[in-house]
């Protein structure tokens, strides 16, 4: 059968029918339904939601919808022994305590099972000591403290502001600095946009609002007790002492009213410069300890959370492909939330729900996609991407042979300014072409394409007339698919104006105030941005699953490989003498990139010209496209990060959220001037260059003519 026969209607008409079926009103209704009570991973409420979604996806018309369960390590506060932080006087009396819960939003006062703010996977402990303010607790912040200011954090409790980097990296840095505890807080400078009111009167963070979140350093491992393997009934589980990525010191998050009380008494060294000062009415002294009259007072943490193996549930829906049922396009997003999940994740889950409904309508009219589409509602994303990772571990053999693409669907909005896309270079052209066909929802761009408004508001730094597309990092459910398995991946959402809004994430992220009303009143009253995101995500899935030739352009990979090679070469060239001394050369890497570029160009010509009616040839060319991303996987993984196996991209070692290019070389070069054995350090740089060179060359050869 030809593709058009199998799908009953012409491909163009299919896509239009699919997009036209998506309705803002439905997304709004689904969001409301998903946000009335908390859906914390591992709770009965979230299991019930899984069953509801299973039932509705079946009604929508999917071929099958299954729940898959795993027993993974989760973490919860002790219900009878709350976590808090005290200022204690010389007699040990508590003279100030941080709050035990957030003041609930209006209308939600009687909701039960709102988990109080906590840092998931914090060990128990009651450390006591002087406070040291460490800014954002980034690598460079600790360099400034330890190397420039000669401040020793050993035995101290550090207080760090949220923002800039993933909280798990902050905790890891504090541990390495010798801290005995970590206090994380939201500074108004990062979480209170000027000229906007606090919730419930606006979208800013109130002083009592607190960001929850896990503080793991899993590096892609999934369940900390079963790295590499699914956490099923017969899984071997490590002991807690051997678990992957757990923090070793107590950690607790607070809001800025509590932070005010802790920071206002700080003494010791002044902050090094204005980049260390937030916007609280405090001096932002670094410490250690309190000033003058208060110097005998100390800070004490009281952390009693417990980690326990708990059952989680993914929902996996299947829409079988008519022509290539053994090729999978996956649309996945998580279902579990910290509290109500008004934005994270339910603004994404509601979009997925509507996409499933639209595909289901087409199927009921006799249509099927060319390839199989899998829909996933992941559990326990907030606890370390556990649901998606365990499922991928369980199905890794199928996925690495059959996985065409993964589209992520967490929060649909983090603002309402313009589109934000992170994806593999293979998907650049797909995204550009799709957004040219979609209408912009932005004010002032009526009748214009999404591509046009996106390009105007978020221009590419390299190519004029094109929009910015960023590298994939981590911190979301695409991680296992892209970084471990090498399946082409992408994500899209509506975002804020990064030029004018300096806050990190949206202010109410992971707080009790992330409600349906937040979205409906302040972010997207007409749900037009949600609809646009549904069209982008759904449109990408549609094209990936239904186009005769996979909508991947390998030439775009060639372009970025050259850019990344230039970038890493320039970093290395900051040490010209050492490069000479240790005979470090990037010639081989540039040669491999050149080869890749030439082979990709020839492949694209063949792709344009081959006989698309020949099913064997078609499958062969599509397989070369599908397996190109896979070719960038090194089975040995990155140094000390075995589950980050992509040689071109990995989450930054200093910020899980950010993507780093040529991460093996980058990490080998990082802070190399401080290494005790320069010969060994530069040897490792050379080893990483050779791995990158081999991988790029090997990937290029997968695009060569097969015989």
């Amino acid at each position: 059968k030809s593709s058009s026969e199998a799908t009953n209607i012409t491909p163009k008409h299919n896509m239009k029918a699919f997009l036209d079926e998506l309705k803002a009103e439905n997304i709004k209704k689904f969001l409301h339904n998903f946000t009335q009570i908390p859906h914390l991973a591992g709770t009965e409420q979230n299991f019930q939601l899984a069953k509801q979604i299973q039932s509705q996806w079946k009604e929508f018309g999917l071929d099958s919808v299954e729940l898959t369960h795993y027993d993974v390590l989760l973490s919860y506060p002790n219900k009878t022994h709350p976590n808090y932080i005290s200022i204690i006087n010389e007699d040990g009396n508590e003279i100030f305590n941080t709050s035990l819960f957030e003041p609930p939003p209006a209308g939600y006062e009687n909701v039960s099972d709102i988990v109080p703010p906590f840092s998931a996977f914090s060990p128990q402990g009651m450390p006591e000591g002087d406070l040291v303010y460490v800014n954002y607790a980034r690598t460079e912040d600790f360099f400034k403290l330890e190397r420039d200011m000669k401040i020793n954090c050993s035995g101290k409790i550090v207080i760090a502001r949220y923002g800039k980097v993933f909280r798990g990296n902050k905790v890891k840095n504090a541990q390495l600095a010798g801290a005995t505890g970590v206090i994380l807080y939201s500074d108004p400078d990062d979480y209170f946009a000027p000229g906007v009111k606090s919730y419930p009167d606006g979208w800013n963070l109130p002083g009592g609002g607190v960001q929850r979140g896990n503080i793991l350093n899993l590096n892609g491992a999934g369940d900390p007790l079963t790295p590499g393997y699914p956490a099923n009934e017969y899984a071997y589980r490590r002991g807690m002492a051997e678990a992957v990525g757990l923090p070793s010191i107590p950690v607790h998050p607070i809001g800025y009213y509590d932070a005010q009380k802790l920071l206002e008494k700080m003494g010791g060294s002044a902050s090094p410069d204005s980049s260390w000062r937030g916007s609280l009415k405090v001096p932002y002294n670094v410490g250690p300890g309190f000033t003058g009259n208060f110097s005998t007072q100390k800070v004490k943490m009281h952390i009693h959370s417990t980690s326990e193996v708990t059952r989680i549930y993914n929902v996996i829906g299947t829409l079988r492909g008519a022509v290539e049922p053994d090729r999978y396009v996956i649309l996945g997003g998580h279902r579990d939330s910290w509290v109500f999940g008004g934005i994270d994740p339910q603004s994404g889950a509601a979009v997925v729900h509507e996409i499933v409904r639209s595909f289901g309508m087409l199927k009921k009219e006799g249509w099927r996609p060319r390839r199989t589409i899998l829909f996933a509602s992941w559990d326990a994303e907030e606890f370390g991407l556990l649901g998606s990772t365990e499922w991928a571990e369980e199905n890794s053999r199928l996925l690495q042979e059959r996985g065409v693409a993964y589209i992520n669907a967490d929060s649909s909005i983090e603002g309402n300014y313009t589109l934000r896309v992170d994806c593999t270079p293979l998907m650049y052209s797909l995204v550009y072409n799709l957004t040219k066909e979609l209408e912009s929802p932005d004010e002032g761009f009526e009748g214009k394409s999404l591509y046009e408004s996106w390009t105007k508001k978020s221009p590419s730094p390299e190519f004029s007339g094109m929009p910015r597309i960023s590298k994939l990092g981590s911190g979301n459910d695409f991680e296992v698919f892209f970084q471990r398995l090498g399946i082409a991946s992408g994500r899209a959402r509506y975002t804020k104006n990064w030029e004018t809004n300096k806050f990190s994430s949206y202010p109410l992220y992971h707080s009790v105030y992330e409600t349906y009303e937040l979205v409906e009143k302040f972010y997207d009253p007409m749900f037009k941005y949600h609809l646009t995101v549904a069209q982008v995500r759904g449109g990408m899935v549609f094209e990936l699953a239904n186009s005769v030739v996979l909508p991947f352009d390998c030439r775009d990979y060639a372009v970025v490989l050259r850019k990344y090679a230039d970038k890493i070469y320039n970093i290395s060239m900051k040490h010209p003498q050492e490069m000479k001394t240790y005979s470090v050369s990037f010639d081989s890497l540039f040669s491999a990139v050149k080869n890749f570029t030439e082979i990709a160009s020839k492949f694209s010509e063949r792709l344009r010209d081959f006989d698309k009616s020949n099913p064997i040839l078609l499958r062969m060319m599509n397989d070369q496209l599908m397996f190109l991303e896979r070719a960038f996987i090194d089975p040995l993984g990155l140094p000390d990060r075995p589950f980050y196996r992509h040689v071109i991209y990995a989450p930054s070692s200093h910020n899980k959220y950010a993507g780093e290019s040529f991460p093996g070389i980058y990490d080998a070069l990082f802070d190399i001037e401080s290494k005790v054995d320069p010969s060994q350090a530069w040897g490792e740089v050379k080893r990483q260059i050779s791995i990158a060179t081999f991988t790029v060359q090997a990937a290029a050869e997968t695009l060569s003519e097969v015989a």
């Epitope: 808090y84 003279i95 100030f96 305590n97 941080t98 709050s99 035990l100 819960f101 003041p103 609930p104 209006a106 006062e109 606090s198 002083g207 009592g208 009213y257 509590d258 005010q260 009380k261 206002e264 009415k281 009259n293």
Partner: antibody, heavy 125, light 111 residues
């Protein structure tokens, strides 16, 4: 309309106990800190105690420390003052008051914006 | 005794202005915001000024607050007969870990 209504006052002998209540309505009680303030006959205002919205913090005037306990039941929208070992000098009109929000700090460090009409406590033998 | 000191009384004729001072220390006025309360005879106190100089809605702009260092003042311009009342300054005290009221000032409108 925001309203605070105190009750539980009366005449009591020195050394005995009394519990005052303050019923709140017209606002989201669970999100506010709450104070007790008293005024002895013909005297000025004297702050007695404050409790945070979640009871994580309770502060007392030195004159009542160890004898009085402030508490709240958020499910009942009610504030309490348990007064033990009462003395003649505790004779006063007792007001409950809502903590004042100013956006820069926890409300319980900011004083009061809404007051009840008061309940009279007389400690006399 | 109170740690915030106010003059016991102040007076003025209708239309005149009157200023009440409130003297404290670095642990109260010096480091925390000042509030002013008005207590009309036989009634509960009422918030007049918060955060040093902010007026709640419904309070006439004849009332204004200011703060400098460890002292604060309340100014009443265009005195009216209904302004006859007791006025209290107040602030949190970090050393006492408690809220403190001033000694109170009785304002009399003459004539």
């Amino acid at each position: 309309e925001v309203q605070l209504v105190e009750s539980g006052g009366g005449v009591v002998q020195p050394g005995r106990s009394l519990r005052l209540s303050c019923a709140a309505s017209g606002f989201t009680f669970i999100t506010y800190g709450m104070h007790w303030v008293r005024q002895a006959p013909g005297k000025g205002l004297e702050w007695v105690a404050v409790v945070s919205f979640d009871e994580s913090n309770k502060y007392y005037a030195d004159s009542v420390k160890g004898r009085f306990t402030i508490s709240r039941d958020n499910s009942k929208n009610t504030l309490y003052l348990q007064m033990n070992s009462l003395r003649a000098e505790d004779t006063a009109v007792y007001y409950c008051a809502r903590a004042l929000r100013d956006g820069n700090n926890w409300d319980y460090f900011n004083g009061m914006d809404v007051w009840g009409q008061g309940t009279t406590v007389t400690v006399s033998s | 005794q109170s740690v915030l000191t106010q003059p016991p009384s102040a007076s003025g004729t209708p239309g005149q202005g009157v200023t009440i001072s409130c003297s404290g220390s670095s642990s109260n006025i010096g480091s925390n915001t000042v509030n002013w309360f008005q207590q009309l005879p036989g009634t509960a106190p009422k918030l007049l000024i918060y955060s040093d100089n902010q007026r709640p809605s419904g309070v006439p702009d004849r009332f204004s607050g200011s703060k400098s260092g460890t002292s604060a003042s309340l100014a009443i311009s265009g005195l009216q007969s209904e302004d006859e009342a007791d006025y209290y300054c107040a602030a949190w005290d970090d050393s006492l870990n408690g809220y403190v009221f001033g000694t109170g000032t009785k304002v009399t409108v003459l004539g």
